[in-house]
Interface confidence: medium
């Protein structure tokens, strides 16, 4: 029985050019992560598994830097980065978690214009 | 363009090692995971495991865990298969790939085959 | 481990026919997080490695002709050749790529009349 769950950063916003981190977390289980896979969309970002280590796309190696911990960060922003990521958690012996994060990347003006109405 | 470059066929005796080479060409070699595939005569197709070259990590099929060992030298792109305390039960065709898992395809890129042969 | 069990075998057909051929897993290749399928189908023609022609359950690799289609679930999934021609003799395999290891089925061998 898949008992766990996952927390995720959720919907975040981030300006063009800048650095987000996504970052996923399970909780409520002790099954063994063996391997965490980032995707958007159709595209397979990076793979963290407990025995080959970090592997990054080749197609986004230059953008993509593996952690904090199991996250990811994404660099030098553009809007076409706009849109859905999943951390897909494959365990043992509960099966696949999959947390979803939706990512906003904002012209720089439009980010910092909605800076102001943010509640603190 | 991309090649895999596999040494040649190998004839040895049963309770000894060979040494298998994939040379890499054509892409930067640390940034695609290597894999093994093993095809005995007339059978069909079994996964011995898989390489990060930029890491060295590993991941093998419990099958192949005591038999084959994977490793790979990032200075001249070539990564090798030893298989070990050889019996007839290993002589087969083993095919190195270039394993790309990131969206748009599998493994598009192949070795021709080495045939190893164990006969006393 | 994730067992790929292919039928049939074999099977031997004419030229222009249709040809369907099954691959079950033991375990669900779908993701259910981003609905993806992690299930690959290769083509194997004498003395030649394996050729990849369906990925992803039903997305056809880049040059694989219109002919070839992939379907199916979480468990179980179809290889379909519309109008065979006599260059499809080959084995084809079905593969988990879903977690390590990532194994093949048995293979289903075509064969022309």
């Known amino acids: 029985m898949m008992t766990g769950t996952i927390e995720t950063t959720g919907n975040i916003s981030a300006e063009k050019g800048g650095s987000i981190i996504l970052q996923c977390h399970l909780s409520s289980t002790t099954a063994q992560v063996t391997q965490v896979n980032w995707e958007q969309q159709d595209q397979l970002l990076a793979i963290c598994n407990a025995d080959l280590g970090w592997h990054i796309s080749p197609s986004f190696k230059d953008r993509v830097a593996p952690g904090p911990g199991l996250g990811l960060t994404l660099q030098s922003l553009t809007v076409n980065d706009t849109g859905e990521y999943f951390c897909i958690y494959h365990t043992y012996p509960d099966g696949t978690y999959t947390g979803r994060i939706f990512l906003e990347v904002l012209e720089s003006s439009v980010a910092e214009h909605g800076a102001r109405f943010q509640i603190p | 363009q991309v090649q895999l470059q596999q040494s040649g066929a190998e004839l040895v005796r049963p309770g000894t090692s060979v040494k298998v080479s994939c040379k890499a060409s054509?892409?930067?070699?640390?940034?695609?995971?290597i894999e093994w595939v093993k095809q005995r005569p007339g059978q069909g197709l079994e996964w011995i495991g898989v390489?990060?070259?930029?890491?060295?990590?590993?991941n093998y099929n419990e099958k192949f865990k005591d038999k084959a060992t994977l490793t790979a030298d990032k200075s001249s792109s070539i990564a090798y298969m030893q298989l070990s305390s050889l019996t007839s039960d290993d002589s087969a065709v083993y095919f190195c790939?270039?394993?790309?898992?990131?969206?748009?395809?599998?493994?598009?890129?192949w070795g021709p085959g080495t045939l190893v042969t164990v006969s006393a | 481990d994730i067992v790929m069990t292919q039928s049939p075998s074999s099977l031997s057909v004419s030229a222009g026919e249709k040809v369907t051929m099954s691959c079950k897993s033991s375990q669900s290749l779908l993701n259910s997080g981003n609905q993806k399928k992690y299930l690959a189908w290769y083509q194997q023609k004498p003395g030649q490695p394996p050729k990849l022609l369906i990925y992803?359950?039903?997305t056809r690799e880049s040059g694989v002709p219109d002919r070839f289609t992939g379907s199916g679930s979480g468990t179980d999934f179809t290889l379909t050749i519309s109008s065979v021609q006599a260059e499809d003799l080959a084995v084809y395999y079905c593969q988990n790529y879903h977690r390590f290891p990532f194994t093949f089925g048995s293979g289903t061998k075509l064969e022309i009349k």
């Open positions: 390489i990060n070259p930029g890491s060295g990590g590993t």
């Open positions: 992803g359950a039903s």
């Open positions: 790939a270039r394993f790309h898992y990131y969206g748009s395809s599998l493994f598009p890129y």
């Open positions: 054509g892409y930067a070699f640390s940034d695609y995971l």
